[in-house]
């Protein structure tokens, strides 16, 4: 019995179906086919879970969180024992193993390994201003998404004809911050943060209203 090489890993957007491949060759009839799919979740590597089981001509559910979402892609028994996972969740990320036994065929490689990574687009980021909006001050524009896998990068732009940040601005696209030093009237305007990763983008907006000191009325 020989389980074929799997592609190293599969990436899928959260909520989309994933197919985890596993095929094998065997010299024996498929009368005593026994297939166990296991997962070692990334979130809990010490706690392997059963995903689905085929034994004695019957299918059995694995861990409760997979109930109703997992099945074999084809009619069993077969030499293609790939599975699908519907409505993928972040917690489905992990290393999946198919363990195949088909007595009396023994020997050879009976395990296939595939990694599954569930990707999440950036959630709508939260934009904030740190510091005083008085003219001459330094301000920090903050942007962060609560969700996003892979981790989003953040690009700030000023929403006007140029889309350029003021010349006194420095940007950190990893942290999602922009520091604008010595703000002036020309710093005022709408600033948009675009949070991006491999599968999506999301935006938020700030209205920077730089305030000049008001002349005092002298009684």
């Amino acid at each position: 019995l020989e389980v074929s090489e799997s592609p190293g890993s599969i990436q899928v957007a959260r909520g989309q179906p994933a197919v985890l491949p596993c095929t094998f060759t065997t010299s024996a009839a498929l009368i005593n086919l026994n297939v166990i799919w296991m997962v070692t979740p990334l979130s809990n590597a010490n706690q392997p879970e059963q995903v689905i089981l085929y034994q004695g001509g019957q299918m059995f559910d694995g861990a409760p969180r997979f109930h109703g979402r997992v099945g074999f892609t084809g009619t069993m028994p077969a030499t293609n024992v790939s599975i699908f996972i519907n409505n993928t969740q972040l917690s489905d990320t992990g290393t999946y193993q198919c363990l195949v036994n088909n007595l009396p065929d023994i020997g050879g490689r009976n395990i296939g390994v595939t990694g599954l990574t569930v990707l999440v687009p950036p959630s709508a980021p939260h934009c904030q201003i740190q510091g005083s909006q008085d003219i001459g001050s330094d301000v920090i524009l903050l942007c962060s998404s609560e969700e996003g896998i892979p981790r989003p990068t953040y690009l700030w732009e000023k929403l006007d004809n140029t889309l350029k940040l003021p010349p006194t601005a420095t940007q950190d696209q990893v942290q999602g911050t922009v520091t604008i030093r010595n703000i002036s009237a020309l710093s005022s305007g709408l600033y948009q943060c675009v949070a991006s990763n491999a599968i999506g983008t999301s935006t938020c907006l700030l209205d920077l209203q730089v305030i000049s000191p008001q002349p005092r009325n002298i009684g």
């Epitope: 959630s123 709508a124 980021p125 939260h126 934009c127 904030q128 201003i129 909006q133 000023k158 929403l159 006007d160 004809n161 009237a185 020309l186 005022s188 305007g189 709408l190 948009q192 999301s202 935006t203 938020c204 907006l205 700030l206 209205d207 920077l208 209203q209 730089v210 305030i211 000049s212 008001q214």
Partner: antibody
Amino acid sequence: EVKLVESGGGLVQPGGSLKLSCAASGFTFSSYSMSWVRQTPEKRLEWVAYISNGGGSTYYPDTVKGRFTISRDNAKNTLYLQMSSLKSEDTAMYYCARHGDGYYPWFAYWGQGTLVTVSA
Amino acid sequence: QIVLSQSPAILSASPGEKVTMTCRASSSVSYIHWYQQKPGSSPKPWIYATSNLASGVPARFSGSGSGTSYSLTISRVEAEDAATYYCQQWSSNPFTFASGTKLEIK
């Protein structure tokens, strides 16, 4: 008391131009971003232009970009909207709106509006 | 562009009832604003940044939500609440409004 009074609306032919004004009082005009928002006869609200408090930054939706120009005169406490190449779909009540304090853009005060009708 | 949908389009309630109207966005947005408009008047700011009541808005109003789903709730409706309520987003240009929920008092 914050007060915004729009003027300049009226009947104009398709392809024509019109300039709206908004006189502001009761607050420090130069400290606040301003916008124009319109409401169609079907009661749909549409944001049409934004200008920063200093006047150096403007922004528009694609539907009016290149046809409408927002400006302000902080010395006169007045906001303007120059509209050109007008289309029938520009027919609406036009409101001048002052943005709120803080950094969330939102329309904290609205004027009573001025009606623009584009028709042959 | 982000499309905002409000439901229901028309909401009928008796004084004292609790009512909730929803605003759904076609993509995730960071916050929503709500405006109230009565016939013949200009819109008034009602709730800003999802949950903050604008000045003068009664405490029976509240706002909540995140991502693509937001709501405005009135704990005990009064006759003066009859109006059309619009939600609006500033996350992405164009800064769109929904078509509104008209609240009628029986």
